[in-house]
Interface confidence: medium
C-alpha cells in the first residue's frame, strides 16, 4: 500500500546529519612551540556551498574574545583571514571539508586556557554552531634553550658576541669570559615573547666566552671561542 511505500522510501533515504563538533578535551604543548587545536564538525545542510565564516574564540563560548576569524566566499575553498591575534593563529583545516583546525605559533604560558571553534553559514542556510566545551590548551613552562650564539664584527676592528635563548618563564642571560674577574658586562634585551637576547659589546681578550641562560626550570650554557690570531672566530657549544 501507499503508506508502506512511503515508509520504505523513508527507510532508505539518507538521514540528515545533526550539528555536532568534535574537539579533543585537551592539547598540551611547550612554551615557544606551536600547537594544533583540532576541530571538525558535521551539519545538516547537505552540499552547502554558500558563504561561511570560521571563528575561534578564547575564554568562554559565544562571548569570549575572538582570536581568529576567516571568511570563505561562495564556492571558494580559500578562507580569507580577517583576524589573527598577534599574527600567531592560522587555519590548518578546510572549513568546506568540515575542518576548522587551528595552528597557534610561538606559544606563551598566557595562551593557556579554553578555545572554542565556531562556524557560520550565512547564505541560504542561515545557520551556525559553536563548540560549547571547547578544547583546553595547556602550555607548559620550558627550560632554557640557547638557540643562537655568535661572534660578530664590531666597531673599530673589535668583536661583539650575541646570545639568544628561549624559555618560559623567559630566562635571565649572563656572559662570562676570560679573566680578569671571569665575567663581563652584557646588554640584555627582551626579545619577542619567550625569547631573550644578550649582547657582549666588546670582546677584549682571546679565549672562551660562555652564555648562561637560567630560569626556574633549569639552565643552559653555550660557548664561543675568540682567537684573533687565527683570523676568524670559531664556535663551540
Amino acid at each position: 500500500d501507499a503508506s508502506g511505500d512511503l515508509l520504505n522510501t523513508e527507510a532508505h533515504s539518507a538521514p540528515a546529519q545533526r550539528w555536532s563538533m568534535q574537539v579533543p578535551a585537551e592539547v598540551n604543548a611547550e612554551a615557544g612551540d606551536a600547537a594544533v587545536l583540532p576541530c571538525t564538525f558535521t551539519h545538516p545542510h547537505r552540499h552547502y556551498d554558500g558563504p561561511l565564516t570560521a571563528i575561534w574564540r578564547s575564554g568562554e563560548p559565544y562571548a569570549g574574545p575572538q582570536v581568529f576569524r576567516c571568511t570563505a566566499a561562495p564556492g571558494s575553498e580559500l578562507c580569507q583571514t580577517a583576524l589573527s591575534l598577534h599574527g600567531r593563529f592560522r587555519l590548518l583545516g578546510n572549513p568546506r571539508r568540515n575542518d576548522l583546525s587551528l595552528r597557534v605559533e610561538r606559544l606563551a604560558l598566557a595562551d593557556s586556557g579554553r578555545y572554542f571553534c565556531r562556524v557560520e553559514f550565512t547564505g541560504d542556510a542561515h545557520d551556525r554552531y559553536e563548540s560549547r566545551h571547547g578544547v583546553r590548551l595547556r602550555v607548559t613552562a620550558a627550560a632554557p634553550r640557547i638557540v643562537n650564539i655568535s661572534v660578530l664584527p664590531g666597531p673599530a676592528h673589535a668583536f661583539r658576541a650575541l646570545c639568544t635563548a628561549e624559555g618560559e618563564p623567559p630566562p635571565a642571560l649572563a656572559w662570562s669570559g676570560p679573566a680578569p674577574g671571569n665575567s663581563s658586562a652584557a646588554l640584555q634585551g627582551q626579545g619577542h615573547g619567550y625569547q631573550v637576547t644578550a649582547e657582549l659589546p666588546a670582546l677584549t681578550r682571546d679565549g672562551r666566552y660562555t652564555c648562561t641562560a637560567a630560569n626556574s626550570l633549569g639552565r643552559a650554557e653555550a660557548s664561543v671561542y675568540l682567537f684573533r690570531f687565527h683570523g676568524a672566530p670559531g664556535t663551540s657549544t
Epitope: R18, W19, S20, E60, P61, Y62, A63, E120, T122, H126, D127, R128, Y129, E130, R132, H133
Partner: antibody, heavy 123, light 107 residues
Amino acid sequence: QVQLKESGPGLVAPSQSLSITCTVSGFSLSNYGVHWVRQPPGKGLEWLVLIWSDGSTTYNSALKSRLSISKDNSKSQVFLKMNSLQTGDTAMYYCARHPYDDYSGYYYTMDYWGQGTSVTVSS
Amino acid sequence: DIQMTQASSSLSVSLGGRVTITCKASDHINNWLAWYQQKPGNAPRLLISGATSLETGVPSRFSGSGSGKDYTLSITSLQTEDVATYYCQQYWSSPLTFGAGTKLELK
C-alpha cells in the same frame, strides 16, 4: 508544569551587592540552562547571563565584572550575584529557561519565564 | 554588539484590524530572531523563534517574516488580549540583545 520563581531582597543600598535565587520546577537544571534578564521600570529588556546545563556560563560582557552566576542542581536553584549596585540597577529581575540545551545545537531564546523579583537600589 | 531597532515605540490599533511591527538589526542575524509579548505586570512570553516559527499554543493570527537585517511581526484580526508590548530579540551572537519594544494601544 514548568515553573520558575525568583526571590530577592527587594531593597538594596547603593554600592552593596545583590543576591537573587531562581527556584525551578517541572524540569531539571541538569538538562536545561537558565538565563537572567532585567527590566528597569518602564523600559526594555536587558540580557545578563546564561548558565548552561553543565554549569558553564556565558555573560553579557558589559556586566561581566559585576556578575556571578551559579546553581545547585539538587535543589533546583540558580543563584545570581551582582556587585556594586547603583540606582541604575533598579529593575525587575527575571530568570527564564533556555529551551534547548543538547547535541542538536543551541537556541538563545527563553521559552518559560518567572514572574520576576523587583529590586530597588536606594539609600 | 548587535543593536535591535523597533521603529515604532507605540502603535494605535483597532480591534479586528491588522498590525505590523518592524524590527531592524544593526548587522545580519540570519533569521535568529525571536518575538516576545509582554502585558503590564507580567513576564514576557515567547511567541516566535527562528523569525517565523510559532511557539506551541500561540494563536495562528500571529506570524513572523523577514531575513537578513529586517524582520516583521504581523497580527491579523487583532483581539483585546493582544494589546501588549512586543519585543524582538536577536540570538545570532552574544550578548543577546532586545529591541526597545513596541506598545500597542487601542484607538
